[in-house]
Interface confidence: medium
């Protein structure tokens, strides 16, 4: 199916930028892996690069405004021609759910005191309003609560006094015709208009104010301008060459508003002075290599020694990584393919251990299933031997850091019947539903 093709993908917002055009296939659009596409206008934007997870969204608001609730966030698998980690297809949403508490207590209503006395009338003549007030303190509300109803009430009042009426101008009358149809004669042509103080007239008893300003005004007449001439387009110019050497590009034609040129305030030509076309080089763009994550460290060994485990003998270990994805003469990966370090082996070493403090509460699992729970743990943590943190392996090469490597066998006193891990679980409360945010916008 044809798609809308864009030249940029904005990682921070997940939006397509720089529309190249529509009516092209995903395969042609994604000849350039820097490009992105939409299946329909306003739909989900997918980048042409290999799929990976987007950043997590911000946490949604807590599902309740007071006491303990839950909140969701999500991330989306974005990209083309592959899968994200976990064998997940592009477009899939992954969710996380955690407990939240915006406010520990919930609001409690208060009660009103009695009404205070009436204030004076709001006007000194004719009819107005007067107001009285009461306080929300009988009892006072708690935890951001309020009292039901209004803190003040008003009623009509009559001063038994007649108000004066002040004068106001009616609208201006029409301009009188000019005394001549052109400028430059023996008399400067003028036009005049007038207005009346009748909207309303000022009262006599009690006396109102007269209208401010003048009852008439004059101005000079201006001559008629020459007739305007509307602009017209000239022919389209030649098509510009395709500006790219790979993937899709955009060529352009131009025309000028000079057939004729607009004159005396006539309108400019309607429509566009340029038009664009998609050009297809049918050549895939280079794709630079990207390092995979480092592999596991190899076992910690020392040459010519069968085992150095559980001994204060430094060894060496290495790890590697692979340069993936380089295609069509893209750049090779920069940096080293192998990493070497010095190490002490504590693989399967019986070590004294101590219980850790409780971990923080984990995420609610499953985030989109029923009855999610969260957990925290205490772990039996090994106490590492006090071996020297640096060693000098070769004369004149200086001190090198030494890292502990391997899985020891920590020994802790039994805690709640457990020797290695103690876990506590708790249900998550007021759980909201997982809904695709793209669908909610529609």
């Amino acid at each position: 199916d044809p798609v809308l093709c864009f030249t940029q993908y904005e990682e921070s917002s997940g939006k397509c930028k720089g529309l190249l055009g529509g009516g092209v296939s995903v395969e042609d659009c994604c000849l350039n892996t820097a490009f992105a596409y939409q299946k329909r206008s306003g739909g989900l934007c997918q980048p042409c690069r290999s799929p990976r997870w987007s950043l997590w969204s911000t946490w949604a608001p807590c599902s309740v405004t007071c006491s303990e609730g839950s909140q969701l966030r999500y991330r989306r698998c974005v990209g083309w021609n592959g899968q994200c980690s976990g064998k997940v297809a592009p477009g899939t949403l992954e969710w996380q759910l955690q407990a939240c508490e915006d406010q520990q207590c919930c609001p409690e209503m208060g009660g009103w005191s009695g009404w205070g006395p009436w204030e004076p009338c709001s006007v000194t003549c004719s009819k107005g309003t007067r107001t009285r007030r009461r306080a929300c303190n009988h009892p006072a509300p708690k935890c951001g609560g309020h009292c039901p109803g209004q803190a003040q009430e008003s009623e009509a009042c009559d001063t038994q006094q007649v108000c004066p009426t002040h004068g106001a101008w009616a609208t201006w009358g029409p301009w009188t015709p000019c005394s001549a149809s052109c400028h430059g004669g023996p008399h400067e042509p003028k036009e005049t208009r007038s207005r009346k103080c009748s909207a309303p007239e000022p009262s006599q008893k009690p006396p109102g104010k007269p209208c401010p300003g003048l009852a008439y005004e004059q101005r000079r007449c201006t001559g008629l301008p020459p007739c305007p001439v509307a602009g017209g387009w000239g022919p389209w110019g030649p098509v510009s060459p395709c500006p790219v050497t790979c993937g899709l590009g955009q060529t352009m034609e131009q025309r000028t508003c000079n057939h004729p040129v607009p004159q005396h305030g006539g309108p400019f030509c309607a429509g566009d002075a340029t038009r664009t076309h998609i050009c297809n080089t049918a050549v895939p763009c280079p794709v630079d290599g990207e390092w995979d994550s480092w592999g596991e460290w190899s076992p910690c060994i020392r040459r010519n020694m069968k085992s150095i485990s559980c001994q204060e003998i430094p060894g060496q270990q290495s790890r590697g990584r692979t340069c993936r994805g380089r295609k069509f003469d893209g750049h090779r990966c920069a940096g080293q393919q192998q990493d070497i370090r010095h190490c002490y082996s504590i693989q399967h070493c019986p070590l004294k251990g101590s219980w850790s403090e409780w971990s923080t509460w984990g995420l609610c699992m499953p985030p989109c299933g029923p009855n999610p729970t969260r957990a925290r743990q205490r772990l039996c943590t090994p106490l590492l031997p006090k071996y020297p943190p640096t060693v000098s392996m070769v004369e004149g090469q200086g001190e090198k850091n030494v890292t502990f490597w391997g899985r020891p066998l920590p020994r802790c006193e039994e805690l709640q019947g457990q020797k290695l891990v103690v876990e506590e679980k708790r249900p998550c409360l007021h759980v909201p539903a997982c809904k695709d945010p793209e669908e909610e916008e529609l």
Epitope: A89, C368, P370
Partner: nanobody, 129 residues
Framework: QVQLVESGGGLVQAGDSLRFSCAAS????????MGWFRQAPGKEREFVAA????????YYADSIAGRFTISRDNAKNRVYLQMNSLKPEDTADYSC??????????????????????WGQGTQVTVSS
């Protein structure tokens, strides 16, 4: 053991309606997302519709949008497919499927048959013109 049993298939005229039912047993039905797929003779299996465990979200293939409706009853351990304005091209073997991941959502997840854990045997629908 786990069982998904479809019912409600048969021979109908073009323009008629039909309602499928899929009865589930042997697993916690209310924790699973459910989907319907179909396979016409000589063609690949095709996604029809899906519904999340809670019933809050539903997803449909473009070819059936507006004509078919998926729903579920967690009390009865059943998922339904209401099919209106049937066409000869709707002729196929219809199967229901169950997914218990509870972790992902979105059309691009539920329209892939390999994400589902359990499948029914299927029921045949023939639409004559």
């Amino acid at each position: 053991q786990v069982q998904l049993v479809e019912s409600g298939g048969g021979l109908v005229q073009a323009g008629d309606s039909l309602r499928f039912s899929c009865a589930a047993s042997g697993f916690t039905f209310s924790s699973y997302a459910m989907g319907w797929f179909r396979q016409a003779p000589g063609k690949e299996r095709e996604f029809v519709a899906a519904i999340t465990w809670s019933g809050v979200s539903t997803y449909y293939a473009d070819s059936i949008a507006g004509r078919f409706t998926i729903s579920r009853d967690n009390a009865k351990n059943r998922v339904y497919l209401q099919m209106n304005s049937l066409k000869p091209e709707d002729t196929a073997d219809y199967s229901c499927a169950a997914d218990g991941s509870g972790r992902y959502s979105g059309m691009e997840y539920y329209n892939r048959d390999w994400v589902y854990d359990y499948w029914g045997q299927g029921t045949q629908v023939t639409v004559s013109s």
